[in-house]
Interface confidence: medium
């Protein structure tokens, strides 16, 4: 299996530093993947014009992202630790089918594709460690996410484009309500 | 462009470490494979550290084979208890060896002999 | 992770067609990450397909490259003397591992 990073791999940048606390580890993998995003948003962008299409909220009804809700504890009000925990971790893991839609979806940045997917594995396991209610965690049917996976793959072209386009703006909001909220724990 | 060295004669049993220096591109944009080849033989991948420094080596290359990013341009390649089997031509390669943007270094020769 | 290369061996005169067929133990990465490449002695190799069925930059449209999960094929349509060289498949597999199938030869008479 992989080795993530900040385990036995080495830090290059500074590699005199201090070991980097959980938190720390977690914050850094976060800004990682978001900068993993913006690099795959700016093909998509480049490629369609789906950042400026109005036809958005059409398709995203049809794909049921995970999203941040009040009642998840998550936002500054009513904020709840271990509630918000499990959201999280919850909605990377119902995040990961569409990851592995996103493998086959670029070109230029395939590379940057397959890092953010298992720059996420290595997050999700970070928080796990984290979590204490492990039981609250519900995992996605390996079946359920195969036939959605087909599904997304037998769409048409314009379909496909937009489908990109509408993973990356969630798991990048997702990203970001998550930061947030893991920097107030 | 990538480019291998470190490549020499060693005697069995000993180390070796081989760099591979990347031109034009840093190592934040694009991982890097290291694939061998014996004399007149196939080709055989073993490992590659991803731009999310994630390493993945072959089964048979884990425990003796260290795949290392050592600054923003360079890997190294990381051999121990070598024996004349390991003799081989070893490649440097940008990117996984499936991905489009692959490019391959000339190659620097290992010889385990005694 | 194994893939097979079919066949070891194959002579084509010019203008023939040739096909080389690469089988995986496994379903490769997301069924599609196999690529094709070509080398010729004293080379590094030199990518000609990838995703399957891609063709790379600056190689001729007479290489081609179908399948997908286990079974792969290479066709090179219109054998020319320049095709005569060793022929590798090469995945990926879940973790990102790799694999290089045993090598084709391929001889133009």
């Known amino acids: 299996a992989p080795v993530p990073p900040g385990e036995d791999s080495k830090d290059v940048a500074a590699p005199h530093r201090q070991p980097l606390t959980s938190s720390e580890r977690i914050d850094k993998q976060i800004r990682y993947i978001l900068d993993g995003i913006s690099a795959l948003r700016k093909e998509t962008c480049n490629k369609s014009n789906m950042c400026e299409s109005s036809k958005e909220a059409l398709a995203e009804n049809n794909l049921n992202l995970p999203k941040m809700a009040e009642k998840d504890g998550c936002f500054q009000s009513g904020f709840n630790e271990e509630t918000c925990l499990v959201k999280i971790i919850t909605g990377l893991l119902e995040f990961e089918v569409y990851l592995e839609y996103l493998q086959n979806r670029f070109e230029s940045s395939e590379e940057q594709a397959r890092a953010v997917q298992m720059s996420t594995k290595v997050l999700i396991q970070f928080l796990q460690k984290k979590a204490k209610n492990l039981d609250a965690i519900t995992t996605p049917d390996p079946t359920t996410n195969a036939s959605l996976l087909t599904k997304l793959q037998a769409q048409n072209q314009w379909l496909q484009d937009m489908t990109t386009h509408l993973i990356l703006r969630s798991f990048k909001e997702f990203l970001q309500s998550s930061l947030r909220a893991l920097r107030q724990m | 462009s990538v480019e291998e060295s470190g490549g020499r004669l060693v005697a069995p049993g000993g180390s070796l470490t081989l760099t591979c220096k990347a031109s034009?591109?840093?190592?934040?944009?694009?991982?890097v494979s290291w694939v061998r080849q014996a004399p007149g033989k196939g080709l055989e991948w073993i490992g590659y550290v991803s731009i999310a420094d994630t390493i993945s080596y072959a089964n048979w290359a884990k425990g003796r084979f260290t795949i290392s990013k050592t600054s923003s341009t360079t890997v190294d390649l990381e051999m121990t208890s070598l024996t004349t089997e390991d003799t081989a031509t070893y490649f440097c390669?940008?990117?996984?060896?499936?991905?489009?943007?692959?490019?391959w270094g000339p190659g620097t020769l290992v010889t385990v002999s005694s | 992770q194994v893939l097979t290369q079919t066949p070891a061996s194959v002579s084509a005169a010019v203008g023939g067609t040739v096909t080389i067929s690469c089988q995986s133990s496994q379903n490769v990465y997301s069924n599609a990450f196999l690529s094709w490449y070509q080398q010729k002695p004293g080379q590094p190799p030199k990518l000609l397909i990838y995703?399957?069925?891609k063709l790379a930059s600056g190689v001729p449209s007479r290489f081609s490259g179908s399948g997908s999960g286990t079974q792969f094929t290479l066709t090179i349509s219109g054998v020319q003397c320049d095709d005569a060289a060793t022929y590798y498949c090469a995945g990926e597999y879940e973790g990102g591992i790799g694999t290089f199938g045993g090598g084709t030869e391929v001889v133009v008479v």
């Open positions: 390669v940008r990117g996984f060896i499936t991905y489009s943007g692959v490019l």
């Open positions: 034009g591109f840093s190592l934040s944009s694009s991982g």
């Open positions: 995703k399957a069925s």
